[in-house]
Amino acid sequence: MLRRRGSPGMGVHVGAALGALWFCLTGALEVQVPEDPVVALVGTDATLCCSFSPEPGFSLAQLNLIWQLTDTKQLVHSFAEGQDQGSAYANRTALFPDLLAQGNASLRLQRVRVADEGSFTCFVSIRDFGSAAVSLQVAAPYSKPSMTLEPNKDLRPGDTVTITCSSYQGYPEAEVFWQDGQGVPLTGNVTTSQMANEQGLFDVHSILRVVLGANGTYSCLVRNPVLQQDAHSSVTITPQRSPTGAVEVQVPEDPVVALVGTDATLRCSFSPEPGFSLAQLNLIWQLTDTKQLVHSFTEGRDQGSAYANRTALFPDLLAQGNASLRLQRVRVADEGSFTCFVSIRDFGSAAVSLQVAAPYSKPSMTLEPNKDLRPGDTVTITCSSYRGYPEAEVFWQDGQGVPLTGNVTTSQMANEQGLFDVHSVLRVVLGANGTYSCLVRNPVLQQDAHGSVTITGQPMTFPPEALWVTVGLSVCLIALLVALAFVCWRKIKQSCEEENAGAEDQDGEGEGSKTALQPLKHSDSKEDDGQEIA
C-alpha cells in the first residue's frame, strides 16, 4: 500500500483560493513511499522505496533528490545538479541511477545496523517539491535458547529449582513465554532481563523458579515481535521419588460459570504414576470453607454423593487422572469454592470456584401517571427485570444515548431460590416527547437486557397557568376584532347612504350606476386579467 504525500488532487473541488493555499502548503509534487516500515535484518541490505511522477519533458538536470534522517535532518544521500552527490552516511548508501529518470528515487542501505533504525525522509524537488518519510525497522533473529538448571542434581518433588533460558544476539527486545508440558502458561516467578551489546543486539536471560512436581517439562519460547520468529527450548525434569512428593492437583484458575438449572463440571486432574491403580486412589470433594463432604471415592470404589444426590464423578476417566466432579441442576446456593483432595501414596488438593449465574428477563416498563401526559409533567418510569443472578447493574439513558443518573432508585430482592428481581425507578420531567431506555446487565454473563419507552405528550397542550393566560388573550383579541369589524361596518354603511342620496339628485340611468362595493366588469385587456378592486 502506498502512502501519498503532497497530493494536489484534494484541491480540485475547492475554490481557487483554497487550491492555491493547498499548493503552497504541500507542494505540487507527489512523493510515494511504503506505508509500512521496511524491515531489514542486521547485516543485510535494505531498499527504502521512494518514487515520484516525472512530468513530460522531465530531465535529470532538473532533479534535486535529498535523503535525510527525519528527526535530525542529517544528510544521508543526495542527487543534485544532474549528478549523484554520493553517500553522506558511512558510505553505505546508494541510489538507483538508471531508474531515477523514471521517478524511482529509492535508496539502498548496505550492511544494515541496529543504529540505522528510524525514519528517513525522501525529499524531491523539480519545478515544485514534495517529500515523504519511510521507516526502517531493524531486526535480528534470536538464537535457539539454551536451558540451565540450578540445582541440577539430587532433585526431588517439592524442591524449588531455577531454570534459566538464554537466547542471544536478537533485535528488537524479545517477548519471553514459559509453559508447562501441557502448554499451560507459567507467569508467576519469572524474571526476564535483556542486555544490549555494543552492536545494539540483545541477549535475553529469563529465569523461572518452580516447585517440582513428580516430573515436569518446562518450555521457554523467545519471540522476536518484528520477525514473528519463535525460538523454543524445553527441559524435562524427572526428580527422584521422594518423601517430598505431593500429588500435583490441577484445577482451572478461573471460576467455573454455570447457569442455574444446568449441569456444571468442576474440573480436577492429577498425574497418575506408572503402575497406579484405582485401589490406591482416595478422592474427596468437599466445600472449601465448611469442609462439608460433597463426593468421595475411596477403597477402590465410588462412595457416592453426600450433596443432595446431585454430584457424580467420571468413573471411566479416574484411572487417567481425571478427578472432575459433575454437579447437576445447579442452584444459587451451590456458588462457592469446592476442594478436590486426592490421596494416593502422597496427597494434594486444589480449590475450584463455582460462579452461578442466571440471565435477567427482558425488562418490562411501566409509567405513572400513564395518561394525559403533558410536557413539564413529572413521571415515574419503572423498569423491572426478573429471576437473574448475581445482582444486576442497571443503566438508564435517553433517546440520544445520554446516561441518566439523577433520580434513579434501584432495588433488588432475592426470591426463595436466591434469584434476584430488579426494580429500577427513574423520575423525569417530560419534554415534548422522549425515549427512555433501561439496560439490565448481568455482570457475570455480560448479558444485557434492554427495555425502552417512548412518551409523546399531547401536541398543543400547555401547563395550566399558560392555558388561562392564552384563553384570556384569545378572548380579548376576538372582542377587539369584533369591535373593529362593527366600527368598519358602521362607517361603510354611513358612506353608502350618503352616496345614494347624492345619486338621486343627478340625472342618469339609475341601474347602470355601480357602488363602490361592486366589482367592475373584466376588460378584454390581458393586463387587467385577475385584478380585483374593492
Partner: antibody, heavy 119, light 109 residues
Framework: EVQLVQSGAEVKKPGSSVKVSCKAS????????ISWVRQAPGQGLEWMGG????????NYAQKFQGRVTITADESTSTAYMELSSLRSEDTAVYYC????????????WGQGTLVTVSA | EIVLTQSPATLSLSPGERATLSCRAS??????LAWYQQKPGQAPRLLIY???NRATGIPARFSGSGSGTDFTLTISSLEPEDFAVYYC???????????FGQGTKLEIK
C-alpha cells in the same frame, strides 16, 4: 526452615484434660499432614492421630478414639491435641510431627511436650 | 488394625559389623513402610520410606527391602553413631493411619 514449636510441659490430675499446641512455620501449613505421636518413659512410639488442615477431618488410632481430639487453626498455623480422662499411664512426651507438602511421611518433629499425670 | 512386630528386641553388635533388623506386619501393608532412628533425648529421624527409598541426607550404608508383610533394614557397616533404637512404621491407605513397631535397640557389644 521448617519449625514445629510445641507448648510447655504440663502436670495434670487424673480425670482431667490436657491441650497441647504446636505452631508450625516454614511452608503452607494447610498442605501438610500433622501427626501426634507420644512416647511414655522408656517405651516405644505410639501414633495417636493426625489431621490435614486443608482436608479438615482428623483420624485417630483405635486406642485413643473418643478420648483424643485433634484440631487445626489455619489462620495461626497451629495444631492442637486434646486428651481427656487422663490417667497415670498417659504420662509421656507428646510430639507433633509433619512431612513435606503433600507427604504422609513424618520427617519433621516438634521438641516434645512432657505431660505428667499425677494425683 | 495392623500390628507391626520387630525383631530382635535388642541387637548387640560391634562397629564395622553388618546389622539386619526385621519388621513383620500382621497383614499386607503395600509398600507404605518407613524406618526411623531415635537416640536418647531426641526426636526420631526418618531413614527409609516406601520400604526401600533412602531419605534426604541418609548415608548409603542404610538400606531397606521387603514388601507385603516382611521388611528388613540393613546397616552394612556400623558406625559408632548408629547405635540407637530403630522403629518401623506403616501407613494405611485410607484414612491415613499409622502404626509403629515396638522398636529394636541396637547396642554396642
Amino acid at each position: 526452615e521448617v519449625q514445629l514449636v510445641q507448648s510447655g510441659a504440663e502436670v495434670k490430675k487424673p480425670g482431667s484434660s490436657v491441650k497441647v499446641s504446636c505452631k508450625a512455620s516454614g511452608g503452607t501449613f494447610s498442605s501438610y499432614a500433622i501427626s501426634w505421636v507420644r512416647q511414655a518413659p522408656g517405651q516405644g512410639l505410639e501414633w495417636m492421630g493426625g489431621i490435614i488442615p486443608i482436608f479438615g477431618t482428623a483420624n485417630y488410632a483405635q486406642k485413643f478414639q473418643g478420648r483424643v481430639t485433634i484440631t487445626a487453626d489455619e489462620s495461626t498455623s497451629t495444631a492442637y491435641m486434646e486428651l481427656s480422662s487422663l490417667r497415670s499411664e498417659d504420662t509421656a512426651v507428646y510430639y507433633c510431627a509433619r512431612g513435606e507438602r503433600g507427604s504422609y511421611l513424618i520427617d519433621y518433629w516438634g521438641q516434645g511436650t512432657l505431660v505428667t499425670v499425677s494425683a | 488394625e495392623i500390628v507391626l512386630t520387630q525383631s530382635p528386641a535388642t541387637l548387640s553388635l560391634s562397629p564395622g559389623e553388618r546389622a539386619t533388623l526385621s519388621c513383620r506386619a500382621s497383614q499386607s501393608v503395600s509398600s507404605y513402610l518407613a524406618w526411623y532412628q531415635q537416640k536418647p533425648g531426641q526426636a526420631p529421624r526418618l531413614l527409609i520410606y516406601d520400604a526401600s527409598n533412602r531419605a534426604t541426607g541418609i548415608p548409603a550404608r542404610f538400606s531397606g527391602s521387603g514388601s507385603g508383610t516382611d521388611f528388613t533394614l540393613t546397616i552394612s557397616s556400623l558406625e559408632p553413631e548408629d547405635f540407637a533404637v530403630y522403629y518401623c512404621q506403616q501407613r494405611s491407605n485410607w484414612p491415613p493411619m499409622y502404626t509403629f513397631g515396638q522398636g529394636t535397640k541396637l547396642e554396642i557389644k
